[in-house]
């Protein structure tokens, strides 16, 4: 296994309605044809696995269907996006990017980004 | 959008140096980061170097670690490669090749760039 720099913005705040969109850069040392980036989160020293997905270089970035995260790629970045975030899910996200194919493997981990997440306030009732 | 020509190439003798230069146009090169490739006839194309955005990361193989050297001058629009203890197999067509991104990093993956120079000749012999 070897290392990997990776990049992300150090802060985002997700909009009123619960998207917040970061970008995944990673310094790729060869010609990888398949990558696997992994959203993680860590909240109170607890560590799991937001979403995930496996992309061949030139294609698009697909997650299981019933993901919380969308993304494309445009060489050596990602465009990740998750929904349905509420104030709960405020925490720090950590962009794992694994060279998957061809040998060798390189595994590379963010600092994260610190994902702040405020519920909208409800809408007083109206007289209309 | 962005143009690169490099210069620089030529004729040099085992052992010499040469510096090329990777000069944009179109678009300011802070936005990009920039690597360098060279292939030579009937070999695939050769990673040599990357330098990101701002300068402060550069990324090498093992091949020319040591001998060659990435620079950027963004106030010249202009990446350069100092190429030192030149060798025979050096000669090739040495391209650089630009791609937009948002951090600081870059690749020495030749999939990853979409902006490619015409490429200079480089040629080493006695």
């Known amino acids: 296994c070897k290392a990997m720099h990776v990049a992300q913005p150090a802060v985002v705040l997700a909009s009123s309605r619960g998207i917040a969109s970061f970008v995944c850069e990673y310094a790729s040392p060869g010609k990888a044809t398949e990558v696997r980036v992994t959203v993680l989160r860590q909240a109170d020293s607890q560590v799991t696995e937001v979403c995930a997905a496996t992309y061949m270089m030139g294609n698009e970035l697909t997650f299981l269907d019933d993901s919380i995260c969308t993304g494309t790629s445009s060489g050596n970045q990602v465009n990740l996006t998750i929904q349905g975030l509420r104030a709960m899910d405020t925490g720090l996200y950590i962009c794992k990017v694994e060279l998957m194919y061809p040998p060798p493997y390189y595994l590379g981990i963010g600092n994260g980004t610190q994902i702040y997440v405020i519920d909208p306030e409800p809408c007083p009732d109206s007289d209309f | 959008e962005v143009q690169l020509v490099e210069s620089g190439g030529g004729l040099v003798q085992p052992g010499g140096s040469l510096r090329l230069s990777c000069a944009a146009s179109g678009d300011t090169l802070e936005s990009f980061a920039v690597g360098w490739f060279r292939q030579a006839p009937g070999k695939e194309r050769e990673e040599l170097s990357c330098i990101g955005r701002t300068g402060e990361f550069t990324d090498y193989p093992g091949s020319v670690k040591g001998r060659f050297t990435i620079s950027r001058d963004n106030s010249k629009n202009t990446v350069y490669l100092q190429m030192n203890s030149l060798r025979a197999e050096d000669t090739a067509v040495y391209y650089c090749?630009?791609?937009?991104?948002?951090?600081?990093?870059?690749?020495?993956?030749?999939?990853?760039?979409?902006?490619w120079g015409q490429g200079t000749q480089v040629t080493v012999s006695s």
């Open positions: 090749a630009a791609e937009r991104l948002v951090f600081h990093l870059c690749s020495l993956s030749e999939y990853d760039y979409d902006t």
